[in-house]
């Protein structure tokens, strides 16, 4: 019972984590314009892995995709790769783990096969989570480096005359979503690996013991005892993640209650 619960919980946690990794990868707010200690602008810049956006205080938002592949920084490419690898591994892990779930019966699949599949999916979730955490951390490190560089060069120009105010970027919401999602996927993977140990059939062979009774001799030899729990599950399928994303390159996104002016 505990094994099934651990496996099921691991699956759900990983599912939420992978949904989060997908969401973070698609989000535009990987880096956002730093507003602290800066001249107050009527324009707000933010950037994602795939496009950069500008939101005016008027509510008009314009996003431009990074249409070049070779012109992009190597670090950004690396982050993209890590996130995509994380998503792919996570998706495969989810597929494998569905068939590995103890509450789902598929033909006459042995418990040993389910245990192997559970372990495989667990490892995939762990690697997926680590990829996401690594990707987000690399991007965060890149931001920190650029932040201090742009702070040092905040005011550029001849003879100390201010020429331009450089836009500084700080951590966006996607980074926090990515870290949390990566962590959840990692935890889910660990739980799957723990569940795998409980699923593996233990062949415990007890040595023959002779019981001598008066009158006649009886030899009692118990065979290998295999514990099996027939767990009849009535689990309902819940839709955890709906990845319906809508992107527009130029939209008048009207001022909302959370917009700044």
């Amino acid at each position: 019972m505990a094994v099934t619960a651990c496996q099921g919980l691991g699956f759900v946690v990983s599912l939420i984590g992978i949904a989060g990794i997908i969401a973070a990868t698609c989000m535009d707010q990987w880096s956002t314009q730093d507003l602290y200690n800066n001249p107050v602008t009527a324009v707000f810049n933010y950037q994602g892995l795939w496009r950069s956006c500008v939101r005016e205080s008027s509510g008009f938002t314009e996003c431009r995709g990074y249409f070049t592949l070779l012109g992009l920084p190597a670090m950004l490419q690396a982050v993209r790769a890590l996130m995509i690898v994380g998503i792919v591994l996570g998706a495969i892990g989810l597929l494998v783990s569905i068939f590995a779930l103890k509450c789902i019966r598929i033909g006459s699949m042995e418990d040993s096969a389910k245990a192997n599949m559970t372990l495989t999916s667990g490892i995939m979730f762990i690697v997926s989570g680590l990829c996401a955490i690594a990707g987000v951390s690399v991007f965060a490190n890149m931001l920190v480096t650029n932040f201090w560089m742009s702070t040092a060069n905040m005011y550029t120009g001849m003879g100390g005359m201010v020429q331009t105010v450089q836009t500084r970027y700080t951590f966006g919401a996607a980074l926090f979503v990515g870290w949390v999602a990566g962590g959840l996927t990692l935890i889910g993977g660990v739980m799957m690996c723990i569940a795998c140990r409980g699923l593996a059939p233990e062949e415990t062979n007890y040595k023959a013991v002779s019981y001598h009774a008066s009158g006649h001799s009886v030899a009692y030899k118990p065979g290998g005892f295999k514990a099996s729990t027939g767990f009849g599950s009535n689990t309902k399928n819940k839709k955890i993640y709906d990845g319906g994303a809508r992107t527009e390159d130029e939209v008048q996104s009207y001022p909302s209650k959370h917009d700044y002016v």
Partner: antibody, heavy 118, light 113 residues
Framework: QVQLVQSGAEVKKPGSSVKVSCKPS????????IDWVRQAPGQGLEWMGG????????VYNEKFQGRVTLTADESTSTAYMELSSLRSEDTAVYFC???????????WGQGTLVTVSS | DIVMTQSPDSLAVSLGERATINCKSS????????????LTWYQQKPGQPPKLLIY???TRESGVPDRFSGSGSGKDFTLTISSLQAEDVAVYYC?????????FGGGTKVEIK
């Protein structure tokens, strides 16, 4: 078409307050910011502040901070600008305008002349 | 505050001739995020509210005649009326739409010579 209709001219005493209204039509009131700009007689334009009618969020020109209050009433789709502690140099035509892309003002009210005189 | 300096203060041009108005900002109005300059040009005729001509330094507002054009980047901007018409007699203002407070230039009065 888009129109912004402002309240009529006002004559005020120094130290008093004035409240000018601006009623836009031809678009959804909460979808665009409303800015207030004033113009003293024979002078240039001076931005006073702006309001997001949907949230009530405001941004002010520090020159008027504490004296100007911008509000919006969603039920009547009307924006208001109140200027307190009036002095003679506040005599001007006050305009409301709709902020659009480029943070520019595409539609303006006809203007409200506020005269501050003792 | 960002200071917007317009030159000249007034300009007398013959009908059909080119009129050029300059506007200088104390700080760059170029946004690195979209490479757009947040500068707007308005036309104001006596007794009327200002009328939007050009935004993003060079994008003409719909309905504005194509004889009006905007150019420049960073700190220096220009409004050009390629062939002055009688109805173009007005005061022209440039506006900083990037930094708060949103500031206007002092205005340039265009007259017919």
């Amino acid at each position: 078409q888009v129109q912004l209709v402002q309240s009529g001219a006002e004559v005020k005493k120094p130290g008093s307050s004035v409240k000018v209204s601006c009623k836009p039509s031809g678009y959804t009131f909460t979808n665009y910011l409303i800015d207030w700009v004033r113009q003293a007689p024979g002078q240039g334009l001076e931005w006073m502040g702006g309001i997001n009618p949907g949230s009530g969020d405001t941004v002010y020109n520090e020159k008027f901070q504490g004296r100007v209050t911008l509000t919006a009433d969603e039920s009547t789709s009307t924006a208001y600008m109140e200027l307190s502690s009036l002095r003679s140099e506040d005599t001007a035509v006050y305009f409301c305008a709709r902020r659009v892309r480029g943070n520019s003002f595409d539609s303006w009210g006809q203007g409200t002349l506020v005269t501050v005189s003792s | 505050d960002i200071v917007m300096t317009q030159s000249p203060d007034s300009l007398a041009v013959s009908l059909g001739e080119r009129a050029t108005i300059n506007c200088k900002s104390s700080q760059s109005l170029l946004n690195s995020g979209n490479q757009k300059n947040y500068l707007t040009w308005y036309q104001q005729k006596p007794g009327q509210p200002p009328k939007l001509l050009i935004y993003w330094a060079s994008t003409r507002e719909s309905g504005v005649p194509d004889r009006f054009s905007g150019s420049g980047s960073g700190k220096d901007f220009t409004l050009t009326i390629s062939s002055l018409q009688a109805e173009d007699v007005a005061v022209y203002y440039c506006q900083n739409n990037y930094f708060y407070p949103l500031t206007f230039g002092g205005g340039t009065k265009v007259e017919i010579k």
